[in-house]
Each structure stands twice: as structure tokens, then as C-alpha cells.
């Protein structure tokens, strides 16, 4: 398929991201595929990540991600989480896509990924309060480490959005 045809097809869609940064992947059968993330997003594995500098409630953060055709970060592996941590500022906290809507400690990822208690990264003594129903990534000085903390969803925090890479 010609690139011009691809472009023609793409422009019928609402353009949310006007600039993409792409990496060429050599494919079999003389085809070349491009793997892209929007400009100013971070690339890791098969996903793109946007780290906000603005603070908002969890709900507004999720909506802001949706406006960019993404969702709040869903952490699937230790490697993914470590990559994210490397790109965060230690003095800030960042909403991720994990919440407990009813305050019953039934944690849910925004994309319906099952919550697996054995692969969680809570700080010691967290989660601590059933009225704190949303999760942030934050850095604690003692011991020095990143981890998860439950907070009130209406309190403004930074956030991390995630989307699958765009393939051209």
C-alpha cells in the first residue's frame, strides 16, 4: 500500500496527534513498518507514555488521557514500571489507572486488566484508607524508593497516560 494512500486513510480520522516520532522496523516481504509515538511522548516496548506536568483530579486526568486517545497508565510488568519511574520527578505524585470505586478495596484497572495482588508495588503500610480510592506513584525518602500510595481521587496530582504505539 502506498504511503499516500495510508495518509489519505489516516486523515479521515480525527487528528489528535499532529506530529509523530517514528522508528523504522524492518519487516519481511520487502515491507517497511514504522512504529510511532506522538511527539513529546516516551516510548517503551509496544506503548507510548505521556507524563503530565499539570495537576488535576483522577477523573479529569483520565478524561485528559481520553482526549489524547489514551488512558491512565496500567502497569503490567516490573520493567514497565521501572521505565516509568526513571521519567518521573521525585517531588511529584502521579495518578495511574488503578482505583477502588466503592471503597471496598476492590481495585480495578481502567482497561479491565485483572488486579493481581502478587504483582503490586504498594509502599509499606499502603493502601491505608478506604476513603482514598485512587492510586498515585510517589517517591519516599525512607527507604528511598518509588511505589504506590492510595489518595483521595479529587485531590489534584500529575498523571501518566498510556497508549499503544501507532503503526504506519
Amino acid at each position: 500500500q502506498k504511503y499516500s494512500q495510508l495518509l489519505e486513510k489516516k486523515t479521515t480520522k480525527e487528528l489528535v496527534h499532529t506530529t509523530l516520532e517514528c522508528v523504522k522496523k524492518n519487516m519481511p516481504v520487502e515491507e517497511t513498518a514504522w512504529s510511532c509515538c506522538p511527539k513529546n511522548w516516551k516510548s517503551f516496548s509496544s506503548n507510548c507514555y505521556f507524563i503530565s506536568t499539570e495537576s488535576a483530579s483522577w477523573q479529569d486526568s483520565e478524561k485528559d488521557c481520553a482526549r489524547m486517545e489514551a488512558h491512565l497508565l496500567v502497569i503490567n510488568t516490573q520493567e514497565e514500571q521501572d521505565f516509568i519511574f526513571q521519567n518521573l520527578q521525585e517531588e511529584s505524585a502521579y495518578f495511574v489507572g488503578l482505583s477502588d470505586p466503592e471503597g471496598q478495596r476492590h481495585w480495578q484497572w481502567v482497561d479491565q486488566t485483572p488486579y493481581n495482588e502478587s504483582s503490586t508495588f504498594w509502599h509499606p503500610r499502603e493502601p491505608s484508607d478506604p476513603n482514598e480510592r485512587c492510586v498515585v506513584l510517589n517517591f519516599r525518602k525512607s527507604p528511598k524508593r518509588w511505589g504506590w500510595n492510595d489518595v483521595n481521587c479529587l485531590g489534584p496530582q500529575r498523571s501518566v497516560c498510556e497508549m499503544m504505539k501507532i503503526h504506519l
Epitope: E14, S57, Q59, E62, K63, A66, S99, P101, G103, N131, R133, N152, C153, L154, G155, P156
Partner: antibody, heavy 119, light 106 residues
Framework: QIQLVQSGPELKKPGETVKISCKAS????????MNWVKQAPGKGLKWMGW????????TYADDFKGRFAFSLETSASTAYLQISNLKNEDMATYFC????????????WGQGTTLTGSS | DIQMTQSPASLSASVGETVTITCRAS??????LAWYQQKQGKSPQLLVY???TLADGVPSRFSGSGSGTQYSLKINTLQPEDFGSYYC????????FGGGTKLEIK
């Protein structure tokens, strides 16, 4: 069960001030935003704005900036709507409505408070 | 802000009939749409959210559909208690209600 109970009907003259209350029960008050909705007699619903019950920050729709103020008494799980310098077009029924946890649609509503003008 | 155009403004139907109310948004609202029912002198009640999810306790004769800018609420086999006013509302970039549809008994 979850309830939003509003204060009773008000009879007011133009130029006066009114304060309507909305008392929440059956849930954790500071986990859900509180919205205010106006309904003029025989007319549709109009969103006025909302108050973040955790931070106290208010957001007002364009038509409700100026004479309208939202406030909270968190210890009493109560939200307030105050309208100052009342005008004839303010005579309407006012509803408080809880914003859903994730998406903010209005999952529970107060019974409404009717504001009537006296000459 | 995105505006909502609801139609029809009024509708007469008989018990047992099926009716459809539509809402058009002035921009893509990505399924961030709710439907409410309001009876005379009462507060509105949530029927549907996220365009197609029925709220708790809402009978299955109600159904929501649509995407992008076009949404509809369908009521199958109208019951006497279904008569009243219906409002759509988007919650994408703000909160805006449609003008309402008054459903009356024919």
C-alpha cells in the same frame, strides 16, 4: 442508603440573597463532586457548575459566574448554593446532584428547592 | 463547549409502543453521555450512562446506543410509568443537557 436532602422552598424579593443547602448521607462526602442544576418553570435542565468536595474548588458554567457561589461544610457533609442580588430569572427549582466516581455523570439527585419571587 | 440537540421536543405514544429519542452533539463526545428521566414535580433519575450502560434498577426495556456525535435512547413496550420528560447530557468537555423530550400518553 445514599440520600441528598435539600432545604425547603424559599420566597424571596429581587435584590435579596438566598442560600440553599444540600445534605448528603450514606456515602463518603469528600469522594464525590457536588453539582448544581437549575430548572426554570416548564423548562429544561441547566448545569450551573460543581464544587470539588475535597479541595473546595468551584467551577461555574458561563451563565452562572458572578452572583452564584458554591460552598461546603464538610464536617456536616453539606454543600451550599448562594445566589445574591436575586433577579426574576433566578426564580426556579435548584437541584444538587452527586457526580459519579469515575465519569462524573449525576448518579444521585436532591429533591429540589423551589425559589419563588414575592413582590 | 459542545452543545446537545435533542429531538423530538415532544412525543405522543401509547402503552405498548416503542419510541426512540435522539441526541446530537456538536462535536465528538466519545460516549460520555447519560440519559435521565424526570417525572412532573420530581428530580431527574439516571437511566443510562456511558451511552449504553443501564443504571442500577433501570428496566431492560430501556436501551442506549450511539457513538461519536449521534446517540439515542430506545424504550421498548412503553409502560404507564415511562411517561414524563427525558434529557440527554454529555460530560466530555463540560456538562451540557439536551433540551429535553416530553413523552405524553396518546
Amino acid at each position: 442508603q445514599i440520600q441528598l436532602v435539600q432545604s425547603g422552598p424559599e420566597l424571596k424579593k429581587p435584590g435579596e440573597t438566598v442560600k440553599i443547602s444540600c445534605k448528603a448521607s450514606g456515602y463518603s462526602f469528600t469522594n464525590y463532586g457536588m453539582n448544581w442544576v437549575k430548572q426554570a418553570p416548564g423548562k429544561g435542565l441547566k448545569w450551573m457548575g460543581w464544587i470539588n468536595t475535597y479541595t473546595g474548588e468551584s467551577t461555574y458554567a458561563d451563565d452562572f459566574k458572578g452572583r452564584f457561589a458554591f460552598s461546603l461544610e464538610t464536617s456536616a457533609s453539606t454543600a451550599y448554593l448562594q445566589i445574591s442580588n436575586l433577579k426574576n430569572e433566578d426564580m426556579a427549582t435548584y437541584f444538587c446532584a452527586r457526580g459519579d466516581f469515575r465519569y462524573y455523570y449525576f448518579d444521585y439527585w436532591g429533591q429540589g428547592t423551589t425559589l419563588t419571587g414575592s413582590s | 463547549d459542545i452543545q446537545m440537540t435533542q429531538s423530538p421536543a415532544s412525543l405522543s405514544a401509547s402503552v405498548g409502543e416503542t419510541v426512540t429519542i435522539t441526541c446530537r452533539a456538536s462535536g465528538n463526545i466519545h460516549n460520555y453521555l447519560a440519559w435521565y428521566q424526570q417525572k412532573q414535580g420530581k428530580s431527574p433519575q439516571l437511566l443510562v450512562y456511558n451511552a449504553k450502560t443501564l443504571a442500577d434498577g433501570v428496566p431492560s426495556r430501556f436501551s442506549g446506543s450511539g457513538s461519536g456525535t449521534q446517540y439515542s435512547l430506545k424504550i421498548n413496550t412503553l409502560q404507564p410509568e415511562d411517561f414524563g420528560s427525558y434529557y440527554c447530557q454529555h460530560f466530555w468537555d463540560s456538562w451540557t443537557f439536551g433540551g429535553g423530550t416530553k413523552l405524553e400518553i396518546k
